[in-house]
Interface confidence: medium
């Protein structure tokens, strides 16, 4: 095995290399020096490095490390960011179509209800969108509000068209009666179950993707410790002090250094694995009532059925409500 | 029975589909994302190795640098790291993760807990029939998973689930003109489907 090449007698190569990292040559010795002030590139003999050069190498090493880390995560980061945006947009499209489907159902089956029904349907689906994006809204309240708002209109327009529809008194009574008499049967409860389950899952799915982005961003912008900076400098740049410009670090040595520098980051591994597997489980369960696409695009039909249910029972209902809300009606007719 | 929105809006003859060979629905897109994410499952444990392979490391050279001196690539000294009398690598590992890393680990633990809770084996959610309460029986069975459509036309499934790649562009004034009750016919409403959401690879 040939002996290693001798150190550069004039530090010329080191000077020309260092010039690219740091303009000006005042920090580079003309000829090798003892280097007793060095703290990282501890010399075995004369060295072409100074304390200031060491500092610059440390800075460069840390910048290199950040760049390598960011390029390592680029593909993963892009994958999650793109998909988070795509799914958010897709969910908004589903909500928009579900609203259109529901409005179309009212327009074609119950034209007399449309002006007010459109308003209530619009408010309901606005709340759905807000819920998916993380708003603190109760799904049961949303569904109750939809049916509470719809029933007075159904009663005054379809079941009892002779009534003036401007009175607030009877509307309040009708809203109360809607729940007490279970006017829509079990349909509101059915919708609550389906909507709350599908939206909950959708919401957590989006939350999980956004957290994925946050995880990558956090590790992407880690500040490496001074100790790590010194290890990286010793591995990548200390050979230059001996004029060994073309020599590369040993593979095993690099792995040891990286394990040390990334000890903290690697601790994320266990939770990251669990995150991906848990997300997979969630996605595998996103069907039927756990699939908002399925649930929301079918809502128009269930709402239609709930109104038919009211119409089927119109006779009984009108009598019962007539007694229940008689006081309000008398005040109205006066 | 209710008009189907598809019957209302879609004229099958004018449905223009932009080369969608298979129906790429939201659920297929979700599964595709998970498959891609699973290829990154070892991302963090593999990071040190990734960085070494993407920075200058002696591969074919006989000699390499071990932090203190030039050594033969396969010698004992090559694996050692020339850090004697310096700070200890073990100490570096003992310091534990940065506060920001600890924070993000806590957030991951929390979301993992939530994801697991949501993914519990799903039994039946409503054990009661719809006809137990209210004035009269609905046509829904007790497994409301299956009962998206309610009664009326039997168990109605939405026939034309949203195509993931297809933004259904309704020209109906439903959104903008709540007062407009004019009946729409299929001929009035051409739907063009297009790639509104970019493919992600």
């Amino acid at each position: 095995q040939p002996p290693p090449p001798p150190p550069d007698a004039t530090c010329h190569q080191v000077r020309s290399f260092f010039q690219r990292l740091q303009p000006g040559l005042k920090w580079v010795p003309e000829t090798p020096v003892p280097g007793s002030d060095l703290q990282v590139c501890l010399p075995k003999g004369p060295t072409c490095c100074s304390r200031k050069m060491e500092e610059k190498y440390q800075l460069t090493a840390r910048l290199n490390m950040e760049q390598l880390l960011q390029s390592a995560s680029m593909e993963l980061k892009f994958l999650i960011i793109q998909n988070a945006a795509v799914f958010q947009e897709a969910f908004e499209i589903v909500v928009r179509h579900a609203k259109n489907y529901t409005n179309a159902m009212f327009k074609n089956n119950y034209p007399s209800l449309t002006p007010q029904a459109f308003e209530f349907v619009g408010e309901f689906f606005t709340d759905v969108s807000l819920y998916i994006l993380g708003s603190d809204i109760n799904v049961d309240d949303m569904v109750n509000e939809l049916f509470d708002s719809l029933f007075p209109v159904i009663y005054t327009q379809l079941m009892n068209p002779g009534l003036p529809d401007s009175a607030l008194d009877i509307n309040e009574c009708l809203r109360g009666a809607r729940r007490d008499l279970k006017v829509f049967g079990n349909f509101p409860k059915l919708i609550m179950t389906q909507v709350s389950k599908s939206l909950q899952v959708t919401r957590i799915f989006l939350q999980a993707l956004n957290l994925g982005i946050e995880v990558i961003n956090t590790t992407d912008h880690l500040k490496f410790s001074k100790d790590c900076g010194r290890m990286l400098t010793r591995m990548w740049y200390c050979s230059y002090c001996q004029g060994l410009m073309m020599v590369k670090p040993c593979g095993g040595y690099c792995n040891v250094v990286m394990q040390g520098c990334m000890a903290g980051v690697v601790e994320i591994d266990k939770y990251w694995r669990e995150y991906i597997l848990s997300l997979e489980e969630l996605v595998n369960g996103m069907y039927r009532i756990y699939d908002m696409e399925n649930v929301l695009l079918g809502l128009f039909s269930t709402i239609h059925d709930s109104i038919q249910y009211v119409q089927k029972n119109a006779g009984k209902l009108t009598t019962t409500i007539g007694k229940l809300c008689a006081h309000s009606q008398q005040r109205q007719y006066r | 029975s209710a008009y189907y929105p598809e019957d209302l809006f879609i004229d099958k003859k004018v449905l223009k589909v932009a080369h969608v060979e298979h129906e790429e629905t939201l659920s297929s897109r979700r599964r595709e994302l998970i498959q891609k994410l699973k290829s990154f499952i070892s991302f963090y444990s593999a990071l040190p190795g990734y960085i070494c392979s993407h920075s200058p490391v002696a591969e074919n050279d006989t000699l390499c640098w071990n932090g203190q001196e030039l050594v033969e690539r396969y010698s004992q000294k090559a694996a050692r790291n020339g850090m004697k009398n310096q700070f200890n690598l073990h100490e570096l590992k003992m310091k534990g993760p940065e506060p920001v890393v600890s924070q993000i680990i806590d957030k991951l633990k929390h979301i993992n807990q939530l994801l697991r809770t949501m993914s519990m084996p799903k039994g039946r959610v409503l054990d009661k029939n719809l006809d137990e309460e209210g004035f009269e029986s609905g046509d829904c069975g007790d497994d409301e998973d299956e009962c998206i459509g309610g009664s009326g036309d039997g168990m109605i499934k939405v026939k034309n689930q949203l195509r993931f790649l297809a933004e259904l562009a309704y020209d109906l004034d439903v959104d903008d003109a709540p007062g407009n009750s004019q009946q729409a016919t299929p001929k009035d409403n051409e739907i063009s489907t297009f790639h509104n959401l970019g493919n992600v690879h």
Epitope: S16, F17, L63, E66, Q67 | S55
Partner: nanobody, 120 residues
């Protein structure tokens, strides 16, 4: 090809502030660490500050810490140096430079410089 164009220099009184800009083109700006370097008349160039590609890490020469702030806007491909509490000894030509990426050949890119004169 790679181009770096500095601007924002001028004559300023001691204690006042100045903001230098460096417009970059011809390369993927966010992939490179960038630096400011200055050269006072008749002196060797002196490193001032560096910033990582993403902008999350900044580094300063000890003598300037607290007075100068380096930043970047990757959407505009622009590097900045905010200089506060300027002193006469800050008079120099200020250059922005692109730090060579790991493993790249040893030549780097410099702007033409912008002169900052601090004088009462």
């Amino acid at each position: 090809q790679v181009q770096l164009v500095e601007s924002g220099g001028g004559v300023v009184q001691p204690g006042r502030s100045l903001r230098l800009s460096c417009a970059a083109s011809g390369f993927t700006f966010s992939s490179y660490a960038m630096s400011w370097v200055r050269q006072a008349p008749g002196k060797e160039p002196e490193w001032v500050s560096s910033i990582s590609g993403g902008g999350s890490s900044t580094y300063y020469a000890d003598s300037l810490k607290g007075r100068f702030t380096i930043s970047r806007d990757n959407s505009k491909n622009t590097l900045y140096l905010q200089m506060n509490s300027l002193r006469a000894e800050d008079t120099a030509v200020y250059y922005c430079s692109r730090d060579p990426r790991f493993g790249e050949p040893p030549f780097d890119y410099w702007g033409q410089g912008t002169l900052v004169t601090v004088s009462s």
